[in-house]
């Protein structure tokens, strides 16, 4: 499989906010790639979010989808919103080079992003 | 149109060596790693070897059944990959593909080791 | 090494019905799974790639889905050019890239 490179460990900013860069090594000249974010849990692999992009152009994920990111070569920076302290895990970056054949796959060996949620502010009497 | 045409097999005595070729064409070689798949009579495929490509510093991969006794190279500016197999078995007795990637196959050539 | 467990290892099925072939890995592949087609007498083709994408040239009635551990292969009207064995195979480093033990295909 392709080589894919990740930080071992993210710490989420007090806002939810993790960003990573996700980078890999192409065999190819792949002017399609998909890049996919998972969480491990145990034995439990989840997609947390998805998008296909061509090579130049922007990463764009769905409207709806806690990430963002952007592209530059064979970079991918990462950005995962909305987090909690029960989203801390291991999160997995998987490139697929779509097109033009041949189709290569790199799995991550994961970033461990943790989040701490904010201590609550203590009501104040005025 | 994409072609990989394997040739080099043949009948040939156990501890004995052959050399099988594959000739690719319709593609970009170059950007492809190239493997060896064989399959025993009646029986399913076994991936045998793998070579990357330039980015990769054409590393080479094997099955644990051939390591030892298989090499795999190639020659991007001819579009051919080598598989040299030494010290043959009669284990060994397969119909052997080359695939570009895993996306494209050839026909195959048959290799008989028997004494 | 991960193995990769197909089962299972030959249906019978008549044209039109439904056929379901699954492949488990011994830990989890996250979707590097390759499914082949091998017609008698012929070479394997790529039928999916990547767990559920769909090889060029192949009918849209096959499909790919899973994740983690366990794939399935779906046929989901089966014809009688569908006859052959079907392989899955692990594409995830490290090697080897392992078969499944394949999975023949008949029509009733």
């Known amino acids: 499989a392709m080589h894919v490179a990740q930080p071992a460990v993210v710490l989420a900013s007090s806002r939810g906010i993790a960003s990573f860069v996700c980078e890999y090594a192409s065999p190819g000249k792949a002017t399609e790639v998909r890049v996919t974010v998972l969480r491990q849990a145990d034995s439990q692999v989840t997609e947390v979010c998805a998008a296909t992009y061509m090579m130049g152009n922007e990463l764009t994920f769905l409207d709806d989808s806690i990430c963002t990111g952007t592209s530059s070569g064979n970079q991918v920076n990462l950005t995962i919103q909305g987090l909690r302290a029960m989203d801390t895990g291991l999160y997995i970056c998987k490139v697929e080079l779509m097109y033009p054949p041949p189709y290569y796959l790199g799995i991550g060996n994961g970033t461990q992003i943790y989040v701490i949620d904010p201590e609550p502010c203590p009501d104040s009497d005025f | 149109e994409v072609q990989l045409v394997e040739s080099g097999g043949g009948l040939v005595q156990p501890g004995r060596s052959l050399r099988l070729s594959c000739t690719a064409s319709?593609?970009?070689?170059?950007?492809?790693?190239m493997n060896w798949v064989r399959q025993a009579p009646g029986k399913g495929l076994e991936w045998v070897a793998q070579?990357?490509?330039?980015?990769?510093?054409?590393?080479?991969y094997y099955s644990d059944s051939v390591k030892g006794r298989f090499t795999i190279s190639r020659d991007d500016s001819k579009s051919i990959v080598y598989l040299q197999m030494n010290s043959l078995k009669t284990e060994d007795t397969a119909v052997y593909y080359c695939?570009?990637?895993?996306?494209?196959w050839g026909q195959g050539t048959t290799v008989t080791v028997s004494s | 090494d991960i193995q990769m467990t197909q089962s299972p290892s030959s249906l019978s099925a008549s044209v039109g019905d439904r056929v379901t072939i699954t492949c488990g890995a011994s830990?989890?592949?996250?979707?590097?799974l390759n499914w082949y087609q091998q017609k008698p007498g012929k070479s394997p083709k790529l039928l999916i790639y990547?767990?559920?994408n769909l090889a060029d040239g192949m009918p849209s009635r096959f499909s790919g889905s899973g994740s983690g551990r366990d794939y399935t292969l779906t046929i989901s009207s089966l014809q009688p050019e569908d006859v052959a064995t079907y392989y899955c195979?692990?594409?995830?480093?490290?090697?080897?890239?392992?078969f499944g033990g394949g999975t023949k295909v008949e029509i009733k």
């Open positions: 695939t570009g990637g895993m996306d494209y």
């Open positions: 319709g593609f970009t070689f170059s950007d492809n790693w």
């Open positions: 070579i990357r490509n330039k980015p990769y510093n054409y590393e080479t």
């Open positions: 830990e989890i592949i996250y979707g590097a």
């Open positions: 990547g767990a559920t």
């Open positions: 195979q692990k594409i995830l480093s490290p090697p080897p890239w392992t």
